[in-house]
Interface confidence: medium
């Protein structure tokens, strides 16, 4: 996933605590395009900027997620932040991609890794095995060591996910492949959900 995702994350991380709260409240009432669902209120209100970026991209994909973020920021009077996103949108050619409603409204969109970030942080226990599978191909030595330095499984996974916004799809697939090998029943369980 590319520049749009990073731009959304940048914008949300620029919000103060109160502004982020306000952003979430407005997201609950903003007019959505036909074919798109609303992020559940309970989950939404607990999210930090990274979680919220993941959710926006998994629910609305990058192009429409970017547009929706801009709409809410403008509605909050944060024109400057919205303009920065507008620039990203124009540069990435996201306009055309945003124009279509999901071809199959029942189909899940967004990668497994994005959709199940919170559950993976909570439930993956064999983190070192996952890290070994990603070492070199996805994670640099520095990133590998940074994750290993964390004490609990949850902290390790949280650290691992801090690198995900810069990953492309192949990197996410590599993480999923590792999870399928090491935690097959967890993957199957999440896939059903």
């Amino acid at each position: 996933m590319g520049r749009a995702r990073d731009a959304i994350l940048d914008a949300l991380e620029n919000l103060s605590g109160d502004e982020l709260k306000k952003f979430k409240m407005k997201l609950l009432t903003v007019q959505l395009r036909e074919g798109y669902g609303r992020i559940p209120r309970g989950a939404l209100l607990q999210m930090d900027a990274i979680d919220l970026t993941d959710k926006l991209v998994s629910y609305y994909l990058e192009s429409y997620g970017l547009e929706l973020t801009m709409t809410v920021l403008r509605d909050m009077g944060l024109q400057e932040l919205a303009e920065q996103l507008q620039t990203t949108k124009e540069e990435s050619g996201a306009v055309a991609a945003a124009a279509s409603v999901p071809a199959q409204s029942t189909a899940r969109t967004g990668h497994f890794v994005d959709q199940h970030r919170q559950a993976l942080i909570a439930r993956v226990t064999e983190v070192d095995g996952v890290l070994d599978a990603l070492h070199g191909s996805v994670l640099t030595e520095g990133q590998y060591q940074a994750v290993r330095a964390e004490t609990t499984s949850q902290d390790k996974m949280r650290k691992l996910f801090s690198f995900v916004p810069s990953w492309n799809l192949t990197c996410k697939d590599s993480l999923l492949q590792a999870l399928k090998e090491i935690h097959p029943y967890l993957v199957m369980d999440l896939e059903q959900s």
Partner: antibody, heavy 122, light 107 residues
Framework: QVQLQQSDAELVKPGASVKISCKVS????????IHWMRQRPEQGLEWIGY????????YYNEKFKGKATLTADQSSNTAYIQVNSLTSEDSAVYFC???????????????WGQGTLVTVSA | DIQMNQSPSSLSASLGDTITITCHAS??????LTWYQQKPGNIPKLLIY???NLHTDVPSRFSGSGSGTGFTLTISSLQPEDIATYYC?????????FGGGTKLEIK
């Protein structure tokens, strides 16, 4: 509806290259991977690899590294496969296909191009 | 690479019969198995994904089962339009691999 339209059959000489196109419609091109398979006469299917137009990342079957190159052009909603240094072993029908979901990598292919027959002959 | 072995390679049955095709994976693939039907001169058509889930508009006489390394595709009450070659495909790990196919003919 989702459609994948492939280019016409090709007759090529040994040692040459061929480039096949797969033009998609009916969905947002950058939301889904495009996979390529080939099927040699009277044989089964082989997976070559995928390209993800959303970020241009690709993944190849080791067997086809150096033999096939996958690309995508967002402006025309078209994916391409170029097969190099052709031999008679590369004579096959080449298919592009799209998974049912963009969700993950345990892919099941719900949408297929009609196939492009490549014949390698002197 | 994960090898997918399908058996039998060909099968002859009568209309109305119930037939079973098996697919064996060289290592555990959990439930990440897909079945396709390919009629002569046509493209493969998705029948069943994740071992047992019937794709949209696939008749209910088709069913899939299994997990781990052993999987079966069952067609009950065989119809003339079922004449085709059937392939299994694993999605557990890259490279994605297919079985060699089972060619189904009517007696």
């Amino acid at each position: 509806q989702v459609q994948l339209q492939q280019s016409d059959a090709e007759l090529v000489k040994p040692g040459a290259s061929v480039k096949i196109s797969c033009k998609v419609s009916g969905y947002t091109f950058t939301d889904h991977t495009i996979h390529w398979m080939r099927q040699r006469p009277e044989q089964g299917l082989e997976w070559i690899g995928y390209i993800y137009p959303g970020d241009a990342s690709s993944y190849y079957n080791e067997k086809f590294k150096g033999k096939a190159t996958l690309t995508a052009d967002q402006s025309s909603n078209t994916a391409y496969i170029q097969v190099n240094s052709l031999t008679s072993e590369d004579s096959a029908v080449y298919f592009c296909a799209r998974p049912l979901y963009s969700y993950a990598s345990y892919y099941w292919f719900a949408y297929w191009g009609q196939g492009t027959l490549v014949t390698v002959s002197a | 690479d994960i090898q997918m072995n399908q058996s039998p390679s060909s099968l002859s049955a009568s209309l109305g019969d119930t037939i079973t095709i098996t697919c064996h994976a060289s290592q555990n693939i959990n439930v990440w198995l897909t079945w396709y039907q390919q009629k002569p001169g046509n493209i493969p058509k998705l029948l069943i994904y994740k071992a047992s889930n019937l794709h949209t508009d696939v008749p209910s006489r088709f069913s899939g089962s299994g997990s781990g390394t052993g999987f079966t595709l069952t067609i009950s009450s065989l119809q003339p339009e079922d004449i085709a070659t059937y392939y299994c495909q694993q999605g557990q790990s890259y490279p994605l691999t297919f079985g060699g196919g089972t060619k189904l003919e009517i007696k």
